[in-house]
């Protein structure tokens, strides 16, 4: 009694560019590709790519990232630190379109989320986040 | 309530758990302004690399 | 392998209540949304409602309100749908879906319901 | 309720066959719909989600597209193992619904 794997990927995004293991259905109203969520495949920055409309997606290699002497966190050998986050939003309601990326509710609030990140961290040295994952507080 | 978790990644050497967090919480009032988004209960911690998908979000259940 | 493990046949008196078990396996996540949906005898499929497993978060199809239940177990891995009052309109096929990266994505054998006296 | 409109109710085609099926919705469900295969006896199984995006596993020539509030599954080349009942599912807002399905049958 197996279904199908759901196909989605674990996306890295930042500025409407995003690192990514595999394609994502285009999104109805977010400025990047659709947004990223858990799935049941690991986590890959494989390649930026920057989503022009809905049915195409540009490639290519993402430059190495410069490495440093001191490690505040876990390491990739291109020299990224990784960080878990979790907290509430007491203001909002969850309901089960915030499991599916193509709604217009996981939409707008991954978008949000995104765009306050960017906001947050917009000193060098933030290259996104990816793996969003919503659920009941 | 809606529980959010991700990851998030910065340049080696850049930041550390403590600055992530401070830097998050000390946003959280222009959040709830900008974004009508009230946060609260923030948790930070490093994600081992490799990591899956399946690995960083067993911290909140 | 993502796997939903339905429990087995049910012959069930009318007015009486009904418990069905989906289990999942093979996914290292303990949260996730389970959806519930029938299908009478020869006929389409219709949602029933939602749980999001290990909390108490529910939602349910307007027509089943008040006789269905949606239970969880964490520990198990185990989502639970209560029938109750059942009438012999409620035979069915019962099948559970849950979410992977996405609603719908994985779906049980399902669960055959006969309610008679 | 939003509801889906699924068109034909049944069809005979061969191997080999283009075959294409259509759900029409109510309201605007933008690309919240899933296409399911049924078989007799098996689980059921998610061939397309968000309207257009194949799920892991399932052969190319299943493809999912959407006009307005048109959306179609097409079967480029029916294969053997394509004899079915296909459903069109839209999550847009709850209560979730179905379309009335698709039998497709061997000609």
């Known amino acids: 009694a197996s279904g199908s794997a759901s196909g989605s990927a674990s996306t890295l995004v930042h500025n409407g560019t995003s690192a990514r293991a595999t394609t994502t259905p285009a999104s109805k109203s977010t400025p990047f590709s659709i947004p990223s969520h858990h799935s049941d495949t690991p986590t890959t920055l494989a390649s930026h790519s920057t989503k022009t409309d809905a049915s195409s997606t540009h490639h290519s290699s993402v430059p190495p990232l410069t490495s440093s002497n001191h490690s505040t966190s876990p390491q990739l050998s291109t020299g990224v630190s990784f960080f878990f986050l979790s907290f509430h939003i007491s203001n909002l309601q969850f309901n089960s379109s915030l499991e599916d990326p193509s709604t217009d509710y996981y939409q707008e609030l991954q978008r949000d989320i995104s765009e306050m990140f960017l906001q947050i961290y917009k000193q060098g040295g933030f290259l996104g986040l990816s793996n969003i994952k919503f659920r009941p507080g | 309530s809606v529980v959010v978790q991700l990851t998030l990644a910065f340049r080696e050497g850049t930041i550390n758990v403590h600055d992530v967090e401070t830097q998050f919480n000390q946003y959280k009032t222009e959040a709830a302004s900008r974004y009508n988004l009230t946060i609260s209960d923030v948790s930070v911690s490093d994600v081992p690399f490799p990591f899956s998908a399946q690995s960083h979000h067993h911290h909140h259940h | 392998e993502v796997q939903l493990v339905q429990s087995g046949a049910e012959v069930v008196k009318p007015g009486a209540s009904v418990k069905m078990s989906c289990k999942t396996s093979?996914?290292?996540?303990?949260?996730?949304?389970i959806n519930w949906v029938r299908q009478r005898p020869g006929q389409g499929l219709e949602w029933i409602g939602y749980?999001?497993?290990?909390?108490?978060?529910?939602e349910y199809n307007e027509k089943f309100k008040g006789r269905v239940t949606l239970t969880s177990d964490t520990s198990a891995s185990t989502a639970y749908m209560e029938l109750s009052s059942l009438r012999s309109e409620d035979t069915a096929v019962y099948y559970c879906?849950?979410?992977?990266?996405?609603?719908?994505?994985?779906w049980g054998q399902g669960t055959l319901v006969t309610v008679s006296s | 309720d939003i509801q889906l409109t699924q068109s034909p109710s049944s069809l005979s085609a061969s191997v080999g066959d283009r075959v294409t099926i259509t759900c029409r919705a109510s309201?605007?469900?933008?690309?919240?719909l899933n296409w399911l295969q049924q078989k007799p006896g098996k689980a059921i199984k998610r061939l397309i989600y968000?309207?257009?995006s194949l799920d892991s596993g399932v052969p190319s020539r299943f493809s999912g597209s959407r006009s307005g509030s048109d959306y179609t599954l097409t079967i480029s080349s029916l294969q053997p193992e394509d004899f079915a009942t296909y459903y069109c599912?839209?999550?847009?807002?709850?209560?979730?619904?179905f379309g009335g399905g698709t039998k497709v049958e061997i000609k």
């Open positions: 879906a849950r979410s992977g990266g996405s609603l719908f994505a994985y």
């Open positions: 093979g996914y290292t996540f303990t949260s996730y949304g």
């Open positions: 749980i999001y497993l290990g909390s108490d978060y529910t």
């Open positions: 309201q605007d469900i933008g690309i919240t």
């Open positions: 968000a309207t257009s």
């Open positions: 599912l839209q999550y847009a807002s709850s209560p979730y619904t």
